[in-house]
């Protein structure tokens, strides 16, 4: 694959991943009410990083923002921070990579400057992707912990009517935003790696020495050091690796409620 193609593809993949990170951060469905093996309710609860929502079977949806900073769990704050760091680094990465693209000519910028910028943007995309993946994974871990805790206390609060009153705890499971976040983080990371690989192809090559003639025992023997060709892999017959994005569907694709649980 040519340097330009690798750099361009890396940029596009990172851009898609970055858009996904923004989408995941804004989505309300980071955690959704667990519907499996649960008393069936006519309301569906789901939560995001910024607000929690309830959708009734009437179709009426009400969302409430978390209008507090101090009252929120530290883990949620950490996830927010990681996602925002991912977005900020992504924005900087995109801006830098636009100027670094080989197909765009800006003034008298030489290849070594473009190579440095490509490497910088690649590193930024890698950190951005890792930040998003860590953020989503921390949230997922938090969900798993809470899920099993609430499963253990599934029916709590035996008070009221002679110990017969049951309080059903709402259990939460992975929402669509987690999958969007993982895929997006992965794409941003892959795009960043591709940018870093492209940087190596843009760097002026010092390892390609010209053929030198040596005079030994009156014979002219020309040594062609073909084996010292720069081992970037570009221009060689390296196979093109395709990246498959399974795509992430949001929960609201089936907003008309019914699936396994056709109860909301």
């Amino acid at each position: 694959m040519s340097v330009t193609a690798c750099q361009g593809l890396g940029f596009v993949v990172s851009l898609i991943g970055f858009a996904g990170i923004i989408a995941a951060t804004c989505m309300d469905q980071w955690s959704t009410q667990d519907l499996y093996n649960n008393p069936v309710t006519a309301v569906f609860n789901y939560q995001g990083l910024w607000r929690s929502c309830v959708r009734e079977s009437s179709g009426f949806t009400e969302c409430r923002g978390y209008f507090t900073l101090l009252g929120l769990p530290a883990m949620l704050q950490a996830v927010r921070a990681l996602m925002i760091v991912g977005i900020v680094l992504g924005v900087i990465g995109i801006l830098v990579s636009i100027f670094a693209l080989k197909c765009i000519r800006i003034g008298s910028m030489d290849d070594s400057a473009k190579a440095k910028m490509t490497l910088t943007s690649g590193i930024l995309f890698i950190i951005s992707g890792i930040s998003a993946i860590i953020g989503v994974s921390v949230f997922a871990n938090m969900l798993v912990t809470n899920f099993w805790m609430s499963t253990a206390n599934m029916y709590s609060g035996m008070g009221g009517m002679g110990g017969m009153v049951q309080t059903v705890q709402t259990r939460y499971t992975f929402g669509a935003a987690l999958f969007v976040g993982w895929v997006a983080g992965g794409l941003t990371l892959i795009g960043g790696v591709m940018m870093c690989i492209a940087c190596r192809g843009l760097t002026p090559d010092d390892s390609n020495f010209k053929a030198v003639s040596y005079h030994a025992s009156g014979q002219n023997v020309a040594y062609r050091p073909g084996g010292f060709k720069a081992s970037t892999g570009f221009g060689s017959n390296t196979r093109n690796k395709k990246i498959y994005d399974g795509g992430a569907r949001t929960e609201d694709d089936e907003q008309s409620h019914p699936t396994k649980y056709d109860y909301v």
């Epitope: 006519a42 309301v43 929690s52 609060g157 059903v168 019914p258």
Partner: antibody
């Protein structure tokens, strides 16, 4: 405004089946669950089940699972409930009502009185 | 299934009096997501279909007189009529509108002296 038209009465023989209709107008029929409620003469209300007109997804009260079959016809904005193997216990007024805020039932049909008699 | 228990089963009052009726559920009807209680009150007059009075335990449906108020949370709910009128003669039902299957209470019959 929301209107739900139900036939006034249905006289059926024991063991037979009857298909009750509920024609809706004044709102987007396919967007809201349609509920069915039974009321025996002088008795309280019993929830039978509901159906979502957009895809036919339904929920049933276990008590009526083998008794009532809920269907819809989107083209005519009509919900149906078929009652099978009728006995005197099935003699009642059957209401249809679409879901509303708070999962409540704000609009009710006038009800169909089903009389099971030989 | 959620059991809804209404008391008393009947009440006889004079016009202008204040009336309270109770409804208890076997499971909490409070949704943690929005802190709303999914309990509904209906009024049914003889020969008519039920009429929605209150949803979310205390939200009055439009057109319902403000003498009707709902209160309570979790499992214990109350319907209060501040000053009973002759037209309030009816049976009042509470309904669980949170868990499937939806269930109704057996009703409280309000009679006017």
């Amino acid at each position: 405004q929301v209107q739900l038209q139900q036939p006034g009465t249905e006289l059926v023989k024991p063991g037979a089946s009857v298909k009750l209709s509920c024609k809706a107008s004044g709102y987007t029929f396919t967007s809201y669950w349609m509920h069915w409620v039974k009321q025996r003469p002088g008795q309280g209300l019993e929830w039978i089940g509901n159906i979502h007109p957009s895809n036919g997804g339904s929920n049933h009260n276990e008590k009526f699972k083998s008794k009532a079959t809920l269907t819809v016809d989107k083209s005519s904005s009509t919900a149906y409930m078929q009652l099978s193997s009728l006995t005197s216990e099935d003699s009642a007024v059957y209401y249809c009502a679409p879901i509303y805020y708070g999962n409540s039932l704000a609009y009710w049909g006038h009800g169909t009185l089903v009389t099971v008699s030989a | 299934d959620v059991v809804m228990t209404q008391s008393p089963s009947s009440l006889t009052v004079t016009a202008g009096e204040k009336v309270t009726m109770s409804c208890k559920s076997s499971q909490s009807l409070l949704n943690s997501g929005n802190q709303k209680n999914y309990l509904t009150w209906y009024q049914q007059k003889p020969g008519q279909p039920p009429k929605l009075l209150l949803y979310w335990a205390s939200t009055r449906e439009s057109g319902v007189p403000d003498r009707f108020t709902g209160s309570g949370s979790g499992t214990d709910f109350t319907l209060t009529i501040s000053s009973v009128q002759a037209e309030d003669l009816a049976v009042y039902y509470c309904q669980n509108s949170y868990f499937y299957p939806f269930t109704f209470g057996s009703g409280t019959k309000l009679e006017i002296k």
